[in-house]
Structure formats: C-alpha cells, structure tokens
C-alpha cells in the first residue's frame, strides 16, 4: 500500500481466483483514543472500533472510502483504491491501446518544435467517474523539471456502438535547450482512477523523436507563362523553431489527381518553392519534416490546381 | 577550416557533408541486422557517447560569439563515432547486411572530421570506451543504439553547419 495523495491510498493486488489479498491497517487521524468506529462509503454498518482498523483487501468490494467517527462526528477519511496485477502485469483497463507506433501504446505525444513544449493524449471509452493526473520529468535518476497542466477532455468520437473520449495534456520543460542533443529522455507518468480502480501509464521519449511540424503555411500557385507548369510556394509554419537557418525543414510536394488510383508525382526540396506540372482536377499538397532528423512529417497543406 | 588557431571552417562544404551524414545515418539504421529494439533500455549502453550539450556553444548565439567551442565538440564526436564504426562492434559477427551503407557513413565521418581539422593540427579527442560486447546479439543491440545516438548527434552538427553557412560564411 502506498499514498497517492493526502488520504488516498493504493493497494496493489495480485489478481487471481482465491488470491489471499493484502492486509491493510488503517489509522484514524485524530488525537482521540476511545470511542472510535469505522464505516465504509455510505453504509452505516460499523466495521470495527478503535484507533486502527485491520482489513483484508481482496476485491473491489473491499475498496472505497473508509471513515472513522466519534459520537456522530467524522474524524478522518481514507480512500482505498485497487491496482490489479494479473500474471505479473499491471492492468490497463482504463485506457485504450492506440497500437501506433506499436502495440501497448496508451499515451501518444507530439511536439510542434524544439522549445520543450509537447502535448500528450490518450483514449478511453469510459465517460464518468474518471480522473487523471500527469507528472513529467527529464530523466529518471536525477530528474529535471517538466511542468504539465491539467488533463482535459479534448475530443469525443463515435466508434461503432461505442463512444470514445480523447484526453490531452500540455507540458513544458522548465529549462529547455532547443539546440542541444538530448541525452536523457522525457518521462511522462499518467495516474488514472476510474471509480475505485487505479492504473498508471508511462511514456519515455526524446523531443526529437516526437517532433511533428505544423503544415506549411501560405501555400500559393503561380502559373508560368505558356506552360502547364506552376510555381508552388509556401512558408515555414509559425510554430516552427527559429532561426530557420538553424532549425531547417525539408518539404515534399505532391501532385495528386482526383482519383486515389492516379499516379502521384512527388518532389522533395529544401527550398520553399517548387515547379510542378498542374494536371486538370488535380491538387497540389506540401508537407514538412525536420531536415536533419527523420521524425514525423506534418499533415499536408493543399490547394486545387484550378 | 576550423583549425585550433581559430580560423573559419569551410562552412558550405561542412554543411553538405553533414547533411549527407544525416541521410546515411538514417539509411544505415535498419540495415545493421534484424532486431526490434523498442523494448530495450536506452540509457546504459550509450551514455558513454559524446553529446552536444547546452553549454557547448552550438546554439545560434554561441556560434556567433565563438564557434570554436562547438566545432571542437563536433570534431570530438566525429572521431569518436568514426572509431566505433571501425571497431569490432561493426566489423564483428553478425556481419552487417550487404546493402548497408555503413561504409559510406564511416568514410563521411572521417571526411567531415578532416574538413574540421586538417593534418598536423590537434584538438584533444575523447577517449573511446571499451564497448566490447561478447555476444553477437549484444553487438547487434549496440549497433542500433550507436546509430540512434549518431543520428541525433549529426542532426545537431548539420544544423550548426547550415546556420554557419547561412550566417557566418565570409
């Protein structure tokens, strides 16, 4: 058993049929010594008396808010949550496996630049009685500070018969050094509580590996005289790190017909313009990637050929 | 050329070669043997490699003030990785795949380090750790980790040379 926060405790249980459970001793936070009784949740049934209460925690029915009273007055509460371990593996029932980039990916994180600011998100099908708490640091043995905000519900989607909820959180490294080569990864820890179930999820990454620039901006076409060719131009996204002579992007320009089956013409360039042939009913798209480190490409910015 | 005395490197040549190094480091990564490393701990085996850190003057402002600190750091790293690529970590069993561009990567590391420090000039170089894994699978694991950290190192070096070519070239 360990304390998650004031008056909230997590009991770690090996979860299998007829498991013995864990013996837990609760102590009433009071100078009083006599006349103390204990109850669980809203029940008025007295579970025991005295300053301490010893219970055997085996299942969710044994978890909940234990309260000690004296003469009708509440003295203190202890909320017990359960953290299940099945076959040596901690349960992951609350969050959905996003399976990208690999199985058992519950947290996904992205950064738009090298400033030390990043966003993480996760998915669940649970709509009520759910709380999240997020902590982060750079490195684990001698952690350096990363400040995270509160997790918020950022999207709701319908997936078949199920509703899916997306939560996200923004974090900022306290003393970011955008130009340095990271040697210690960022660690992100999410505590999830659903009713009386506790779970924790972690992710470890370098900012450089989660970079995904915003799409190029101000995508424009300029027809070239007496030719089917057009000059496509664009600009770096506003959110990208500066100066651009240091934090450079590379670009992929694609000409795509209406039908997905049509041949795509692709050009790679480090410049912010390119000359391509504009086919009828086609569209021109441009996306960006860090020039020197192969993290994610941005989403496409597109304009129609006509 | 960035000689210890303090003259400027051939920024544009360094820019081209460092950008080439980035491509080679990425293209070599899947081709050093077959293995999924995602589950392996990253910290222990590669903390000995030199990193370009915050105080090394490799940020735009530090380069403007005095690029020598940064160039020396990059040079140390290049020599370090060049030695690793020539060691039995890469030459031993299991053999690199035939398609692997590690030979080009090795030659380019040496080429860039020579651009930074021509014969006859000497910056002190970092001691190469004795990373000598006994098992072939350990060697494979180490190759992956070395290439992963090399990718990060050459990315910073390439940014330095790109910025230098754009703003510090005479």
């Amino acid at each position: 058993i360990w304390e998650l926060k004031k008056d909230v405790y997590v009991v770690e249980l090996d979860w299998y049929p007829d498991a013995p459970g864990e013996m837990v001793v609760l102590t009433c936070d009071t100078p009083e010594e006599d006349g103390i009784t204990w109850t669980l949740d809203q029940s008025s049934e007295v579970l025991g008396s005295g300053k301490t209460l010893t219970i055997q925690v085996k299942e969710f029915g044994d978890a909940g808010q234990y309260t000690c009273h004296k003469g009708g007055e509440v003295l203190s509460h202890s909320l017990l949550l359960l953290h299940k371990k099945e076959d040596g593996i901690w349960s992951t029932d609350i969050l959905k496996d996003q399976k990208e980039p690999k199985n058992k990916t519950f947290l996904r994180c992205e950064a738009k630049n090298y400033s030390g600011r990043f966003t993480c998100w996760w998915l669940t099908t649970i709509s009520t009685d759910l709380t999240f708490s997020v902590k982060s640091s750079r490195g684990s043995s001698d952690p350096q500070g990363v400040t995270c905000g509160a997790a918020t519900l950022s999207a709701e989607r319908v997936r078949g018969d199920n509703k899916e909820y997306e939560y996200s959180v923004e974090c900022q490294e306290d003393s970011a050094c955008p130009a340095a080569e990271e040697s210690l990864p960022i660690e992100v820890m999410v505590d999830a509580v659903h009713k009386l179930k506790y779970e924790n999820y972690t992710s470890s990454f370098f900012i450089r590996d989660i970079i995904k620039p915003d799409p190029p901006k101000n995508l424009q076409l300029k027809p070239l005289k007496n030719s089917r060719q057009v000059e496509v131009s664009w600009e770096y996204p506003d959110t990208w790190s500066t100066p651009h002579s240091y934090f450079s992007l590379t670009f992929c320009v694609q000409v795509q017909g209406k039908s997905k089956r049509e041949k795509k013409d692709r050009v790679f360039t480090d410049k912010t313009s390119a000359t391509v042939i504009c086919r009828k009913n086609a569209s021109i798209s441009v996306r960006a990637q860090d020039r020197y480190y192969s993290s994610s490409w941005s989403e496409w910015a597109s304009v129609p050929c006509s | 050329r960035a000689v210890p005395g303090g003259s400027s490197p051939a920024w544009t040549q360094c820019q081209q070669l460092s950008q080439k190094l980035c491509t080679l480091a990425w293209s070599a990564h899947p081709l050093v043997g077959h293995m999924d490393l995602r589950e392996e701990g990253d910290e222990e085996t590669t903390n000995d490699v030199p990193h370009i850190q915050c105080g090394d003057g490799c940020d735009p402002q530090g380069l403007r003030d005095n690029s020598q600190f940064c160039l020396q750091r990059i040079h140390q790293g290049l020599i370090f990785y060049e030695k690793l690529l020539g060691s039995d970590i890469f030459t031993g069993e299991p053999s690199l795949l035939p398609d692997s561009p590690v030979g080009q990567l090795h030659a380019s590391l040496l080429g860039l380090s020579q651009l930074l420090q021509p014969e006859g000039h000497h910056w002190e170089t970092q001691q190469i750790p004795s990373l000598s894994p006994s098992q072939p699978w350990q060697r494979l694991l180490l190759r992956f980790k070395i290439l992963r950290s090399l990718q990060a190192f050459v990315a910073v070096a390439a940014r330095v040379f790109a910025h230098g070519a754009a703003t510090l070239s005479p």
Epitope: T250, S294 | T23, S27, L31, P98, D99, P101, G103, G111
Partner: antibody
C-alpha cells in the same frame, strides 16, 4: 522475394536523352538505397550514382558531368535514371542494384544503344 | 577516388584447382569490399561482402579475406560453373569503384 525489373532496350541518337526505369518489389522500397551501374560492351562495371527514396537524396559519379538525374516514385516503388546529351560511348547495359554497400540484388539490365 | 587494382586480369585453370584473385586499393577501406561473379549476358552476382562474409546461397568453396588495402578471393576447388569474370568493389565512401575484372577460363 526481392525483384528489380528494368524497362526494355532503347536505341537513341547522339544528343538525345534516355530514361531507364527499375520497378522494385518484395521489400520496403524507401528503406534501401538504389544504385545505378553501367557496363559498356566488353568492359568493366562503372558506378553511376545512388538515390535514397525516403528523402530523394542522390549522389552522382562526377564523370557524368551533370548529365545524369536519378529519381524515384515511392507510390509505385520505381527508380528512374535519366542520362542526357548521349554520346556513342554511352552505349552500355545499365543496371539498377539495391543497396548502398555491396549489391545483393540487381535488375536484369537495360541495353542502351547510342547510334546515329 | 579510390583506385582498385585487380590481378591477374585473366587466368586459366582446371576443374578442382585452387584459384586466388587479389584486389589492392589505393587507400585504407577497412573491410568494406565486395566480390562479384559475372557470366556473359547476365547481371553480376554478389559472392562476398564486408571482405569475408559469404552472400546468401553462395557455395562455401568461395571465401574472402583481407582488410585495409589488400584483399583476396579464393575458390578452393574450381567447378565447371565457376568459369566467369570476377570483380572486386569497395563500398567505403563514394564514388564506389570496381576492379577491372579477372576472367577465369578453362585451361
């Protein structure tokens, strides 16, 4: 299994251009360098250049003085080698080969004949 | 550019003979050397890479050795299907260069 299938033989006039294609299958195209090698009749092998499909980054043998361009179409896993300002001594079999080191897989070769 | 000097340029041998072909480079190429076999009208076939590693499907009578600037391809017992032209190629930095070839003929 890995296969590289090249376009058919070409006959060109001096000064013209030729574009040879190499369609790859059986592997992840963008992960490997594609190299072009040529062999004049009765002669040895000559490295022309290489391209990395994931980024479009290419390197050329200086011998070809800017006459060669290598491109890839990742949507069809096809590599192209275009040689311009053809001369009679460009008559050769042109091969694509996978990789940026030793070449374990080769195309069947494309004979380009330059003759007036 | 790295120069490759292959010798001999041709040799005559009988089935069962031990054949050795050498390749010398103008500068240190570590172990980044490949050997190919080519038959008329066919693409080259990779035999050895990284100086000593046998490519997939290549008979064990072929072996490679050497590092730095001096390399050797050995065929321990020549078979009828081994009569062909053999090339060495370095893969240490570009441009890659090939040796001029060694033609192995029937005595």
């Amino acid at each position: 299994q890995v296969q590289l299938v090249q376009s058919g033989a070409e006959v060109k006039k001096p000064g013209a251009s030729v574009k040879v294609s190499c369609k790859a299958s059986g592997y992840i195209f963008i992960t490997y360098w594609m190299t072009w090698v040529r062999q004049a009749p009765g002669q040895g092998l000559e490295w022309m250049g290489q391209i990395f499909p994931a980024s479009g980054s290419a390197d050329y043998n200086e011998m070809f003085e800017g006459r060669v361009t290598m491109t890839t179409d990742t949507s069809t896993s096809t590599a192209y080698m275009e040689l311009r300002s053809l001369r009679s001594d460009d008559t050769a079999v042109y091969y694509c080969a996978r990789g940026g080191g030793g070449f374990a897989y080769w195309g069947q070769g494309t004979l380009v004949t330059v003759s007036s | 550019d790295i120069q490759m000097t292959q010798s001999p340029s041709s040799l005559s041998a009988s089935v069962g003979d031990r054949v050795t072909i050498t390749c010398r480079t103008s500068e240190n190429i570590y172990s980044y050397l490949a050997w190919y076999q080519q038959k008329p009208g066919k693409a080259p076939k990779l035999l050895i890479y990284n100086a000593k590693t046998l490519a997939e499907g290549v008979p064990s009578r072929f072996s490679g050795s050497g590092s730095g600037t001096d390399f050797t391809l050995t065929i321990s017992s020549l078979q009828p299907e081994d009569f062909a032209t053999y090339y060495c190629q370095h893969h240490y930095g570009i441009p890659f260069t090939f040796g001029q070839g060694t033609k192995v003929e029937i005595k």
